[in-house]
């Protein structure tokens, strides 16, 4: 058993049929010594008496809010949550496996630049009685500070018969050095509580590996005289790290016909302009990637040829 926060405790249980469970000793936080009784949740049924109460925790029916009283007055509370371990593996019932980039990916994180700011998100099909708490650091043995905000519901989607809820959190490394080579990874830890079930999820990464620039901005077409060619121009996204001479991007320019089956023409360039042939009813799209490190491409920025 360990303390998650004040008056909230997590009991770790091996989960199998007829498991013995865990003996837990609850102590009433009071200078009183006599006349103390204990109840569970909203029930007025007395479990027992004494300043300490020993309970055998085996299942979710044994978890909940234990309260000690004296003469009708509440003295203190202890909320017990359960963390299940089945066949040596901690349960992952609360969050959905996103399966990207690999199986057992519950947390996904992205950064728009090298400032030390990043966003993580996760999915669940649970809509109520759900709380999340996020902590982060750089390194784990001698951790350096990363400050995370509160996790918020950022999207709701219908997937077949189920509703899926996306939660996200923004974090900022306290003393980030954008130009420095990373030697220690960022660690992100999410505590998830659904009713009386506790689970924790972790992710470890270097900022350089989760970089995904915003799409190029101000995408414009300039027709070239007496030609089907156009000059496409764009700018670095506002969110990208500066100076651009050091934090450089490379770009992919794509000409795509109306039909998905039509052949795509692609040009790769380090410049912020390119000359392409603009076919009727086609569109031109541009995306960006870090020039010196192959992390994710941005989403496409697009304009129609016409």
């Amino acid at each position: 058993i360990w303390e998650l926060k004040k008056d909230v405790y997590v009991v770790e249980l091996d989960w199998y049929p007829d498991a013995p469970g865990e003996m837990v000793v609850l102590t009433c936080d009071t200078p009183e010594e006599d006349g103390i009784t204990w109840t569970l949740d909203q029930s007025s049924e007395v479990l027992g008496s004494g300043k300490t109460l020993t309970i055998q925790v085996k299942e979710f029916g044994d978890a909940g809010q234990y309260t000690c009283h004296k003469g009708g007055e509440v003295l203190s509370h202890s909320l017990l949550l359960l963390h299940k371990k089945e066949d040596g593996i901690w349960s992952t019932d609360i969050l959905k496996d996103q399966k990207e980039p690999k199986n057992k990916t519950f947390l996904r994180c992205e950064a728009k630049n090298y400032s030390g700011r990043f966003t993580c998100w996760w999915l669940t099909t649970i809509s109520t009685d759900l709380t999340f708490s996020v902590k982060s650091s750089r390194g784990s043995s001698d951790p350096q500070g990363v400050t995370c905000g509160a996790a918020t519901l950022s999207a709701e989607r219908v997937r077949g018969d189920n509703k899926e809820y996306e939660y996200s959190v923004e974090c900022q490394e306290d003393s980030a050095c954008p130009a420095a080579e990373e030697s220690l990874p960022i660690e992100v830890m999410v505590d998830a509580v659904h009713k009386l079930k506790y689970e924790n999820y972790t992710s470890s990464f270097f900022i350089r590996d989760i970089i995904k620039p915003d799409p190029p901005k101000n995408l414009q077409l300039k027709p070239l005289k007496n030609s089907r060619q156009v000059e496409v121009s764009w700018e670095y996204p506002d969110t990208w790290s500066t100076p651009h001479s050091y934090f450089s991007l490379t770009f992919c320019v794509q000409v795509q016909g109306k039909s998905k089956r039509e052949k795509k023409d692609r040009v790769f360039t380090d410049k912020t302009s390119a000359t392409v042939i603009c076919r009727k009813n086609a569109s031109i799209s541009v995306r960006a990637q870090d020039r010196y490190y192959s992390s994710s491409w941005s989403e496409w920025a697009s304009v129609p040829c016409s």
């Epitope: 007395v46 479990l47 027992g48 309970i55 055998q56 085996k58 299942e59 029916g61 044994d62």
Partner: nanobody, 115 residues
């Protein structure tokens, strides 16, 4: 009429074990949290252990310290108390009760721990 009949008490040496039983009748046993309470010679009634209606939250007094195990069999309307590592100070009349104060209880079974 509510009836609670305890059995299984006796004389045992320190460190020994006993299993107490309590046969319940006259009420819907499976709907009630059940309790064991005890009264040592010349002392007041003392709560020992309790167990929820569906077997959840077995709870124990501090002095039990993992030595006693409470259980129930709702099909047989029977409550049990497995007692091990018995000490001289566990000597008492043990009652099965339907409330933690022992208002509704049986006649008791005597447990004597002595060398």
């Amino acid at each position: 009429e509510v009836q609670l009949v305890e059995s299984g008490g006796g004389l045992v040496q320190p460190g020994g074990s006993l299993r107490l039983s309590c046969a319940a009748s006259g009420f819907n046993f499976s709907n009630y949290r059940m309790y064991w309470v005890r009264q040592a010679p010349g002392k007041g009634l003392e709560w020992v252990s309790s167990i929820g209606a569906i077997g959840n939250v077995p709870a124990y007094a501090d002095f039990v310290k993992g030595r006693f195990t409470i259980s129930r069999d709702n099909a047989k309307n029977t409550l049990y108390l497995e007692m091990s590592s018995l000490k001289v100070e566990d000597t008492a009349l043990y009652y099965c009760a339907r409330d933690y104060q022992g208002v509704v209880r049986g006649k008791g079974t005597l447990v004597t721990v002595s060398s």
